[in-house]
Structure formats: structure tokens, C-alpha cells
């Protein structure tokens, strides 16, 4: 279930997945929520003088049992991911941090009159993930009223330091406030030849697009279908970027589908979940649990309710079916995507809906019933 | 549906076939079950045939060939065409059908969820259009229900493709840039559904397009979320207790 409580002066021991820098516990929790395996986090708001490099450290953790031993640590804040918290799941983060320098790669320095203008500049720049603004009282005159646009490989600061008269914050693209506009075109039989930032395995171009949207550095993508000639690249979704922020003209390529991240959409962005169930498709991955249920929808619901489950397979093979139902395999992987996708199985596969804003319910919000 | 595939029984249980019985009986439009006594469809389906008596509505079927004289059908008790719909314009292409007798819900015949007014800005990424319509522009009605997945196209983009028409906020467009997949003649009134948060929602009603599945000519659908007030008003005023709201 959904657990929103934060534990002050508490640190979870073990279960480490990744460590990043975040300006506060709320942002750390957000990062944990969107990480494919993170269930728990610990954030260091205050550290002893000897460990200043650990201050603002956000430690993302996993646990087979869903919990980890707690140790007392002054200045630490710990909590749970919001993976099953429906309406509380949002990538949008509007907070502004006074007196903090969120460091990263400075790729643009512009003069702006205020912090709002600076944040807007960041929101309207393809590459900007976070920014730092130097006020008119900053000790170095050449940086006063300057807006530094930044990015990093992880999308989060490479370090965070306290500094007077500096204000930092994040791009509001994920709040649907970017004015860049978002092309929703899907280019059939076309590939983009730009720089790959990552690759994942997906069943279709729409899942690929959603993954691109929520990846910190993906601006557009190319997906190769299962008919693609190179076997190792079948069902591979290449997440891409370019210096200009725009792709080079698409190259005609049979069995390739390309498109754009929807990060800069003005209207509500897609949810970070994939609800479609794929018939005759096998999502391979690490086995988490096996249950017997009646129907792929119920299997998906079971996966959604099992917090560590990322995707599932529902088998309809006679040997996999009993009186109480057929085999529902709950699975996971390091990146949340199947490790391999194969076709022709008797059954279906799909993803957990744990990051959907609304948990699945067959009931409509609005029902029309003449009684 | 152009560029689609055969659907399976019970896959789209809200889909109905609207047929006209004159000398013979023919499929003219699709529709969607939204309540035990309610079907939502396109107003233009009734142009020239606004007579409730000649219409027969079939739900829970996959193949039109399943329909015989013995196949149970629903009759129209009340036909509510949007009061602003004009034959000379393409706006307000929406109509409600109140059935004479309530439907029994089964695995193969049940309602589709309606969006809320708040869903007007939601971006849907898993959308499907279904129907028994033509599979090419100069085609014929299909026997087996067809389905096709199709991406939504922003209205500004759609307006650029249809310079001679007004694409307003009560419309929603869907299609691939290079064409190839689309609704077609006979699919009118049928559903454009999208799965969102694990739930299928009726996002559009098949309305019109320039030809079928042409390059740079998306399909245009009536945007259901923009008509929620109208739908609720009509279904409520027809029956004081017609509406039931459940929390999501």
C-alpha cells in the first residue's frame, strides 16, 4: 500500500541501489518513486563537518521484504517511495532553494532580472534540467543577475553546496509548463541517427515514447520492431538526444519507428505507466513470484499490488493452468523493462500499473444507468 | 477500419452495430454502450433517417453474419441529436440513443467508461478505434469487427492538415503522419477508446476524415470529454435516477 510518512533522524541500513544529490527529502522521495527498483530512501539534510560531501546525499534503496533496519542518525530523513500512491505521483517539482548551488554542467549563462525568469528560461530549453541564479548581492560581480542553465547525466545535480545569494531550482517541463511545444508525430519506417543516451527493450513504440518522456536526457527515440533484420536490436528502444535538441532528418528504414519525448507538452503528459496487455508476447526477466489467477487483467492487478513487480506474464499453456486459474509470473529487471521480448507464446504480458495516477478499477467514475 | 486486424469476441464489449431496416437490413454506423439503456453515437448517422422505428441496435456480437431474424436487437425509445447539430456543418456530431429495454450486461456486452470534464487535457498514448466499416476508401462493410491502434494528433497540428475546416476543441484527431491506419465509411458513431490508468475510456466518437487513412489527413472524432455536461443532462433529464457516480 501507500506509505507517505517520513522518519526524522533515521537512516535505513543496507539495500543500496544508487546515490544522488537532491536539495531536500521530498525530491529524494520523488527520485525514488520514479526509480524502477527503489522502495526506500534516506536523505542527509545535515552532516558532521568531516562528511560535508555527503550532505544532500539521497540514498535509494531496495528490499525484498519492503523494509530495512533503521538506525538513528542526526539530520537524516528516511521514507518510502510513493510507487503505489496514485494521485501523489508527480514528476513536477516547483520548489526553489535559496542559498544552494546545485552543480552540474553549465551549458548556458544568461542575464535575467529575477529567479522566475531564470526558471522559465530553463523550462523552455531542451537540455536544461536544473538551474542556479545569482542574485544582485552575489559576491562575484560578473555573475550577478546571471542565470546558469545546467544538466547532468542523471538529471540531478552532481553536487550541492551551500552558497549565499545563490538560488537553485528545477526545470518545470514536468509540470507541463514548457512553451517549447511537443510534436506528437510518430514516424513509421523511419530512424533518427542521433546520439544514443540509453537503450531499453519495449514491446512497441508507445512504451518507448513514454520511457523517453521520463528519461532525464531523452529528447526523441527510435524503436526497432520485432521484424527488424538485426536480431539483437529487435524490440530495442534507443533513447536519443542531440546538441540542437532536435533530431536530424529521419532516415527511411523499414521496421523502425521514431518519435519525440512528450516532456515539453503543455497539456498533461502521459503517465509513467503502460496499461496495455500484449497478447502472445513473453516479457523475460527475473522471477519475483508466481500465482494462479483468472485472466490477464487480474494478473496485471496482482503485479500492480505487488510493489516490486515491474511486469508480468500470464500463461495459458495447459500445463500452466489449474482449477483456480492460470500461471501469473511476476517479474522485475534492473531498469524496469523486460530483458528480452519473444513472440508466439500462449498467453500475454504487460506492465505493473504502480505508477499510474489511478489504480485500476473496473468501475467508471461516471456511470450512466437507467434503473 | 483501414490497416486494422480482426477483433476477438468480448474484446470491445461496448461496441454496437446500428442497422437500418427498410427493404433489407444494413449496417450503417457504430455506437458505444454507456449505460444499460444508453448508446452514444454520431449525429450524422441519422441524417435523412431520423426515424427511431427503422433502427435496430446489436450488441455483444463480433461478426455481422451472426445476425439472423432470431438475433435479439434493441429498439430506439428516444433519439436525442445534439440541439446544435446542423446538417450543413461538422460540429456537435453527437447523439444519444435511449433504448426501449435495458441491456443485460455480459462478458460480451457491457459499457465503456466516460471521461470526466477534467480529462479534456489528458494525453492518451494507448488508443484504439473499432468498427465494421470499409477497409479502404472504395471498399465494403466488413463481417468481423476490426480494431486498430492509432496515435492522437494535437488539434493545432490537425488544423494545419485541414485548412478548409474548423478543428475546434470539441474535436479530437488521430492518425499516423503517413496514413495507413484510420476509421472509414461505416465506422461513424463508433468508439475511439484509450486505456488510461488501467481503464478504457471513450475519448472520441468516429466522425469524419478526408478520405480514409490518407497521408497527412488524420481522422476527426467528436471529443467526448467536451460533451460530458450534455450527456449527463440528457441522461438525467430523461430519467431522474439515470446517473450514478462512483469514486474512482
Amino acid at each position: 500500500g501507500c506509505m507517505t510518512q517520513l522518519y526524522k533522524n533515521t537512516f535505513f541500513r543496507g539495500g543500496d541501489l544508487a546515490a544522488i544529490y537532491t536539495p531536500d527529502a521530498q525530491y529524494c522521495q520523488k527520485m525514488c518513486t520514479f526509480h524502477p527498483r527503489c522502495l526506500l530512501f534516506s536523505f542527509l539534510a545535515v552532516t558532521p563537518p568531516k562528511e560535508t560531501n555527503k550532505r544532500f546525499g539521497c540514498f535509494m534503496k531496495e528490499s525484498i521484504t519492503g523494509t530495512l533496519p533503521r538506525i538513528h542518525r542526526t539530520g537524516a530523513i528516511s521514507g518510502h517511495s510513493l510507487k503505489q500512491c496514485g494521485h501523489q505521483i508527480s514528476a513536477c517539482h516547483r520548489d526553489i532553494y535559496k542559498g544552494l548551488d546545485m552543480r552540474g554542467s553549465n551549458f548556458n549563462i544568461s542575464k535575467t532580472d529575477n529567479i522566475e525568469e531564470c526558471q522559465k528560461l530553463c523550462t523552455n530549453n531542451f537540455h536544461c534540467q536544473f538551474f542556479t541564479y545569482a542574485t544582485s548581492a552575489f559576491y562575484r560581480p560578473e555573475y550577478r543577475k546571471k542565470c546558469l542553465l545546467k544538466h547532468s547525466a542523471s538529471g540531478t545535480p552532481t553536487s550541492i553546496k551551500s552558497a549565499d545569494n545563490l538560488v537553485s531550482g528545477f526545470s518545470l517541463k514536468s509540470c507541463a509548463l514548457s512553451e517549447i511545444g511537443c510534436p506528437m508525430d510518430i514516424f513509421q519506417h523511419s530512424a533518427f541517427a542521433d546520439l544514443n543516451v540509453s537503450q531499453v527493450i519495449t514491446p512497441d513504440a508507445f512504451v518507448c515514447r513514454t520511457i523517453c518522456t521520463f528519461h532525464p536526457n531523452c529528447l526523441f527515440f527510435t524503436f526497432y520492431t520485432n521484424e527488424w533484420e538485426t536480431e539483437s536490436q529487435r524490440n530495442v528502444c534507443f533513447l536519443k538526444t542531440s546538441k540542437s535538441g532536435r533530431p536530424s532528418p529521419p532516415i527511411p528504414q523499414e521496421n523502425a519507428i521514431s518519435g519525440y519525448s512528450l516532456l515539453t507538452c503543455r497539456k498533461t503528459r502521459p503517465e509513467p505507466c503502460h496499461s496495455k496487455i500484449y497478447s502472445g508476447v513473453d516479457f523475460e526477466g527475473e522471477e519475483l513470484n508466481v500465482t494462479f489467477v483468472q485472466g490477464a487483467d487480474v494478473c496485471q492487478e496482482t503485479c500492480t499490488k505487488t510493489i516490486r513487480c515491474q511486469f508480468f506474464i500470464y500463461s495459458l499453456l495447459p500445463q500452466d493452468c489449474k482449477e483456480e486459474g492460470c500461471k501469473c509470473s511476476l517479474r522485475l529487471s534492473t531498469d524496469g523493462s523486460p530483458t528480452r521480448i519473444t513472440y508466439g507464446m500462449q498467453g500475454s504480458s504487460g506492465y505493473s500499473l504502480r505508477l499510474c495516477k489511478l489504480v485500476d478499477s473496473p468501475d467508471c467514475t461516471t456511470k450512466i444507468n437507467a434503473r | 477500419i483501414v490497416g486494422g486486424t480482426n477483433a476477438s469476441l468480448g474484446e470491445w464489449p461496448w461496441q454496437v452495430s446500428l442497422q437500418v431496416k427498410l427493404v433489407s437490413q444494413t449496417h450503417l454506423c457504430g455506437g458505444s454502450i454507456i449505460g444499460r439503456q444508453w448508446v452514444l453515437t454520431a449525429a450524422h448517422c441519422f441524417d435523412g433517417i431520423p426515424y427511431p422505428d427503422v433502427w435496430r441496435i446489436y450488441g455483444g456480437i463480433l461478426s455481422l453474419s451472426e445476425i439472423t431474424k432470431e438475433t435479439p436487437s434493441s429498439r430506439i425509445k428516444e433519439l436525442i441529436i445534439h440541439q446544435e447539430y446542423k446538417v450543413s456543418e461538422g460540429n456537435y456530431d453527437i447523439a444519444l440513443i435511449k433504448l426501449q429495454t435495458p441491456l443485460n450486461y455480459t462478458e460480451f456486452q457491457k459499457p465503456i467508461c466516460l471521461p470526466s470534464k477534467a480529462d479534456t487535457n489528458t494525453i492518451y498514448t494507448n488508443c484504439w478505434v473499432t468498427g465494421w466499416g470499409y477497409t479502404k476508401e472504395q471498399g465494403e462493410t466488413q463481417n468481423i469487427l476490426q480494431k486498430a491502434t492509432i496515435p492522437l494528433v494535437p488539434n493545432e497540428e490537425c488544423q494545419k492538415k485541414y485548412r478548409d475546416y474548423v478543428i475546434n476543441k470539441q474535436m479530437i484527431c488521430a492518425g499516423y503522419k503517413e496514413g495507413g491506419t484510420d476509421a472509414c465509411k461505416g465506422d461513424s458513431g463508433g468508439p475511439l477508446v484509450c486505456k488510461h490508468s488501467g481503464r478504457w475510456q471513450l475519448v472520441g466518437i468516429t466522425s469524419w476524415g478526408e478520405g480514409c487513412a490518407r497521408k497527412d489527413q488524420p481522422g476527426v472524432y467528436t471529443k467526448v470529454s467536451e460533451y460530458m455536461d450534455w450527456i449527463l443532462e440528457k441522461t438525467q433529464s430523461s430519467d431522474v435516477r439515470a446517473l450514478e457516480t462512483s469514486s474512482a
Partner: antibody, heavy 125, light 108 residues
Framework: EVQLLESGGGLVQPGGSLRLSCAAS????????MTWVRQAPGKGLEWVSY????????IYADSVKGRFTISRDNSKNTLYLQMNSLRAEDTAVYYC??????????????????WGQGTLVTVSS | EIVLTQSPGTLSLSPGERATLSCRTS???????LAWYQQKPGQAPRLLIY???SRATGIPDRFSGSGSGTDFTLTISRLEPEDFAVYYC?????????FGQGTKVEIK
């Protein structure tokens, strides 16, 4: 009641200019494509030009391309036809018409459902 | 451009008779974009049929349209005195939009 009223016709010399107006009432002008059709004395109907509801898209018959300009002012519910470099063969009654574009069988329909009474343009020296 | 050829050029009939007017197009025309108009001397044309077969508002049911592809027909089942006029078919399937040359229905 839908009404279209043309004005601006008259006698003009070859090479001259004329601007026709069509005042529309009784319908939401900005929803409709509008068109001009002409009819030379004793001859059949000839389509001249049309303009999209917003005014952003215009199409012309080859016989008038480059010489005639169709425009509209949706705030004034008025359609215009600016005619330059007029020739004797442009002599005709000019009608403005509303283009109805309904929906039938999942396609749009297109037809001229209301016409003005016409205005005569005579090009002669 | 799509050329519309109407036949016959003139049709001489008596009131009460049936009139059949033909319109042939040089290329395929989607029937949604085929219309018929009636014009009397000194008057503006009047819409009779749109979408090849749908009667316009206020048009008596003795007028009917049919056809598809490249062959279209306007039928007046029983001619009334007020029906003697010139009839035009017109396509707006492709630009330039074009009219047929007209068929004159005159009293025999």
C-alpha cells in the same frame, strides 16, 4: 434566416479594378467556407474562388489566378473579391455562396446551400 | 481538372412526365461532393440535391438524385410547371471545383 447580399458590381474598363462585397447574415459566418461563382451572359456557371473559415487558405480558378483576391472579415460578416487587371471575358453576374460542409458516411460533404442574388460586372471600353 | 458532362443539352417534356438528367465526370468523384442546382432565368441558382442523393431542405420529393463514381443522375418523377429551368451538376471533390454545362428542361 440566411441572407447573402452582393454589392460593388458595375461597368469598368479593361485593365481596371473592382471590389465586390458580400454581406452575410443569419448564420455564424466564421464557421463556413465561402465561395464566389460567376455566370457570363447566356452561359453556364463557373466557379471562381473559395476561402477557408479563418481566411487562411484560398484557392482560385486558373482563369482568375494572380488577378483576383478573395478575402473575408469575420468581425464584419463580409466576404470580398478584389478584381484587378479585368478583361472582357470577366463580364458576368458574380454570386457569392455559402459552402455547407456537413458529414455523411464518415466523410465531409460540400455543396453551395445559399446563394446571393448576384451583382453584374461589365468589363468594356 | 474534373470535367462534368451533362446530357442531354436540352430536354423537351410535358408537365407530368418523368425527366432523367445525366451527369458524367471525367474522374472518380466521391458522391459526398456531387450536388445538383436549379436555375431559373434572372435568378440565382438553388440547391436541389447534395451528396449525390440527399434532398436539400424544402425540395419536393419528386426530385431525387442517384449514382456514384463517374455516373450521376437527377430524376424529376412528375414535372410540374415550375420545374422548367436549367439544371447544373457540380463537384467539389477536387479543385478547381467545376460545374457541368447545364441541361435545359423546357416545355414541349
Amino acid at each position: 434566416e440566411v441572407q447573402l447580399l452582393e454589392s460593388g458590381g458595375g461597368l469598368v474598363q479593361p485593365g481596371g479594378s473592382l471590389r465586390l462585397s458580400c454581406a452575410a447574415s443569419g448564420f455564424t459566418f466564421s464557421h463556413y467556407l465561402m465561395t464566389w461563382v460567376r455566370q457570363a451572359p447566356g452561359k453556364g456557371l463557373e466557379w471562381v474562388s473559395y476561402i477557408s473559415p479563418s481566411g487562411g487558405h484560398t484557392i482560385y480558378a486558373d482563369s482568375v489566378k494572380g488577378r483576383f483576391t478573395i478575402s473575408r472579415d469575420n468581425s464584419k460578416n463580409t466576404l470580398y473579391l478584389q478584381m484587378n487587371s479585368l478583361r472582357a471575358e470577366d463580364t458576368a453576374v458574380y454570386y457569392c455562396a455559402r459552402v455547407a460542409r456537413g458529414i455523411a458516411a464518415r466523410s465531409r460533404t460540400s455543396y453551395f446551400d445559399y446563394w446571393g442574388q448576384g451583382t453584374l460586372v461589365t468589363v468594356s471600353s | 481538372e474534373i470535367v462534368l458532362t451533362q446530357s442531354p443539352g436540352t430536354l423537351s417534356l410535358s408537365p407530368g412526365e418523368r425527366a432523367t438528367l445525366s451527369c458524367r465526370t471525367s474522374q472518380f468523384v466521391n458522391s459526398n461532393y456531387l450536388a445538383w442546382y436549379q436555375q431559373k432565368p434572372g435568378q440565382a441558382p438553388r440547391l436541389l440535391i447534395y451528396g449525390a442523393s440527399s434532398r436539400a431542405t424544402g425540395i419536393p420529393d419528386r426530385f431525387s438524385g442517384s449514382g456514384s463514381g463517374t455516373d450521376f443522375t437527377l430524376t424529376i418523377s412528375r414535372l410540374e410547371p415550375e420545374d422548367f429551368a436549367v439544371y447544373y451538376c457540380q463537384q467539389s471533390s477536387r479543385t478547381p471545383w467545376t460545374f457541368g454545362q447545364g441541361t435545359k428542361v423546357e416545355i414541349k
